[in-house]
């Protein structure tokens, strides 16, 4: 599945400039190749878009319907989490049931927890409805215990 990377340039707290890049995320507009990096938290998120209907086009990434919906969802998540520690999203899947969206979000480890991922998404639902014409419901967020996501240790400065 095509993926979206938060491809902004950031500065670390030591002031060295780098591009956030986290496997398994890739991005065609990203100026450096993603490299393996530790200290990443992943969250699995699913939600319903109740004002859309699922059809076979959403099983084919080459269709306009698939690509437009994926673009809107990717843009929406970049708006919700902005850039501070948000590294991107991947593995967008569409399922029947109006439209059920499933995806994985990646964040710099230690910068957010599962409750705040869900809170911030829920806070944005009204804006999503007006900006993207997406009526969102049944939001569910859970931790993803990726083997290469390091254990949470001393906190990341905020």
């Amino acid at each position: 599945t095509p993926t979206t990377l938060a491809s902004h340039s950031t500065k670390t707290d030591a002031s060295s400039t780098h591009h956030s890049s986290v496997p398994p995320l890739t991005s065609s507009n990203h100026s450096t190749s993603p490299q393996l990096s530790t200290g990443v938290s992943f969250f699995f998120l699913s939600f319903h878009i109740s004002n859309l209907q699922f059809n076979s086009s959403l099983e084919d990434p080459s269709t306009d319907y698939y690509q437009e919906l994926q673009r809107d969802i990717s843009e929406m998540f970049l708006q919700i989490y902005k850039q501070g520690g948000f590294l991107g999203l991947s593995n967008i899947k569409f399922r029947p049931g109006s439209v059920v969206v499933q995806l994985t979000l990646a964040f710099r480890e230690g910068t957010i927890n599962v409750h705040d991922v869900e809170t911030q998404f829920n806070q944005y639902k009204t804006e999503a409805a007006s900006r993207y014409n997406l009526t969102i419901s049944d939001v569910s967020v859970s931790d993803v215990p990726f083997p290469f996501s390091a254990q949470s240790g001393a906190g990341v400065p905020g």
């Epitope: 902005k82 927890n113 705040d116 911030q120 905020g158």
Partner: antibody, heavy 119, light 107 residues
């Protein structure tokens, strides 16, 4: 290292306005939310609102909407808060504080700016 | 708005004592609570994030626990430099809110 340096103390008349600044360094200013927090003398902390300098997106505590205006200048990596129609209750120390997201915690704080409203 | 109530408002303590602060939320907030220390005429300093996650540079005598509505900050063996006011803050809902604080005083 990350630094947030605020402008100096202000004394203002009731009904006037004040604009305080928070100059940042040591990180990518555009990519983090800047929050403002009020502390009245001898009192607790109160969140005023936040701005995302990358696109100017703002969120306010309803209690301060219309009285506080948050702006940011990316070219100078400086955040601003303007308080209007000042009343005596606005006498307080105001802090800027950086966060990763809209809803988050604050690891970096400015040193505070004391605003005194007095006739 | 989520109300955070800290107790007690004031606490008299002695060095080396184990000190516990509590913060109660008006509704369940998971683990979205953060603790700060503020000394007179200084900015708040982050001690613990997300109820129990340690912060680089903060002494290990500070620890946190809790979830849902009840949270605790513990200083394992109080040092004289820990005399300050302690605040909890929630990030589970807007507006972001703080507790009213607990002020430590030397007995």
């Amino acid at each position: 290292q990350v630094q947030l340096v605020q402008s100096g103390a202000e004394v203002k008349k009731p009904g006037s306005s004040v604009k305080i600044s928070c100059k940042t360094s040591g990180y990518a200013f555009s990519n983090f939310w800047m929050n403002w927090v009020k502390q009245r003398p001898g009192q607790g902390l109160e969140w005023i609102g936040q701005i995302y300098p990358g696109d100017g997106d703002t969120n306010y505590n309803g209690k301060f909407k219309g009285r506080a205006t948050l702006t940011a200048d990316k070219s100078s990596s400086t955040a601003y808060m303007e308080l209007s129609s000042l009343r005596s209750e606005a006498t307080a120390v105001y802090f800027c504080a950086r966060s990763y997201y809209r809803s988050a915690w604050f690891a970096y704080w400015g040193q505070g700016t004391l605003v005194t409203v007095s006739s | 708005e989520i109300l955070l109530t800290q107790s007690p408002d004031f606490q008299s303590v002695t060095p080396k004592e184990k000190v516990t602060f509590t913060c109660r939320a008006s509704q369940s907030i998971g683990t979205s609570i953060h603790w700060y220390q503020q000394k007179p005429n200084q900015s708040p300093k982050l001690l613990i994030k997300y109820a129990s996650e340690s912060i680089s540079g903060v002494p290990s005598r500070f620890s946190g626990s809790g979830s849902g509505t009840d949270f605790t900050l513990t200083i394992n063996s109080l040092e004289s430099e820990d005399i300050a006011t302690y605040y909890c803050q929630q990030s589970n809902n807007w507006p972001l809110t703080f507790g009213q604080g607990t002020k430590l005083e030397i007995k």
